[in-house]
Interface confidence: low
């Protein structure tokens, strides 16, 4: 099951994701003018064991003489959903291996790519929010959303973040280095659900193939 | 931890241009937002130009403005600063400085607030 909808919104922020928990899938699209191989993957998946996690698969474009064809690949087609793009980022080596057990890296461009990626998270991923040029966040403290499932339902846990132009706004008198730990921030949820600690969402493992669309663009 | 080793200086003279680079190890560096800083003999550390993990927001010291530009690229694990039109009073020893993003949720020019620093390198522009 699809996490419901994209990361939350938040208005002249941009989000991405550190490191890709086990399970999420990354589409093989290729730029204008090319295509996958024939009998090449369709995606890439984020796999692994204890130990090591990596991305099984690979993708490969070839050029066409006719218009590209590639299409969307979800894990499960019947339930599309709308595509989003975010900033435009360059190829990053997110997080170290070792700090994050079973997750990947953003794997490493291939030739001809497209210039927008399509992820399918999983169920426990969090993705991290910035304020793009011109505006400065209210709030100095982390910012990020987590999918996660409630009540047999998925959702993304909305970012404490605010981003305001810079001339709106003075300078931060007194601003402090703000605590590594994020515990106690507030979340708009309702009643039934469980508070859950960075540390038990970052290792919680998805059992099922629950994801959602992701789309970053490249330069 | 961060490693960071910047590289480029040098001496130039007023209207020329240098490119400084800051090469990252250890943890991963998007992770981090980036920051160049200076400091002259007897000044405190200013902040120069900064950078967001997506090269999204990148805030520039108004002195620098127009002249300076900052880049990164996450595949090499290198911000790069970009000096053009350089004037006497950009003489200084140039920093490099990352501050993680878990933390932060914007680009910040404060020096207390970056986690990590380099050792410099000097810039001289003579007149």
């Known amino acids: 099951e699809l996490c419901d909808d994209d990361p939350p919104e938040i208005p002249h922020a941009t989000f991405k994701a550190m490191a890709y928990k086990e399970g999420t899938m990354l589409n093989c699209e290729c730029k204008r003018g090319f295509r996958r191989i024939k009998s090449g993957s369709l995606y890439m998946l984020c796999t692994g064991n204890s130990s090591h996690s990596s991305w099984d698969n690979q993708c490969q474009c070839t050029s066409s003489a006719t218009r590209n064809t590639t299409k969307q690949v979800t894990p499960q087609p019947e339930e599309q959903k709308e595509r989003k793009t975010t900033e435009m980022q360059s190829p990053m080596q997110p997080v170290d291996q070792a700090s994050l057990p079973g997750h990947c890296r953003e794997p490493p461009p291939w030739e001809n790519e497209a210039t927008e990626r399509i992820y399918h998270f999983v169920v426990g991923q969090m993705v991290y929010y910035q304020c793009v040029q011109g505006y400065r966040a209210l709030h100095r403290g982390p910012a990020e959303s987590v999918c996660k499932m409630t009540h047999g339902k998925t959702r993304w846990t909305q970012p404490q973040l605010i981003c305001t132009g810079e001339m709106e706004t003075s300078q931060f008198p007194g601003e402090e280095k703000p605590q590594a730990s994020p515990e106690g921030r507030p979340e708009s949820e309702t009643s039934c659900l469980v508070t859950t600690t960075d540390f038990q969402i970052q290792t919680e493992m998805a059992a099922t193939m629950e994801t959602s669309i992701f789309t970053t663009e490249y330069q | 931890e961060v490693q960071l080793v910047e590289s480029g200086g040098g001496l130039v003279q007023a209207g020329g241009s240098l490119r400084l680079s800051c090469a990252a190890s250890?943890?991963?560096?998007?992770?981090?937002?980036m920051g160049w800083f200076r400091q002259a003999p007897g000044k405190e550390r200013e902040f120069v130009a900064a950078?967001?993990?997506?090269?999204?927001?990148?805030p520039y010291a108004d002195s620098v403005k127009g002249r300076f530009t900052i880049s990164r690229d996450n595949t090499q694990n290198t911000v790069y600063l970009q000096m053009n039109s350089l004037k006497p009073e950009d003489t200084a020893t140039y920093y490099c400085?990352?501050?993680?993003?878990?933390?932060?949720?914007?680009?910040?020019?404060?020096?207390?607030?970056?986690?990590?620093w380099g050792q410099g390198t000097q810039v001289t522009v003579s007149s």
């Open positions: 950078t967001g993990w997506s090269g999204a927001n990148t």
């Open positions: 400085a990352a501050d993680s993003i878990r933390l932060r949720s914007d680009v910040t020019r404060i020096p207390l607030e970056y986690d990590y």
């Open positions: 250890g943890r991963a560096f998007s992770m981090y937002n």
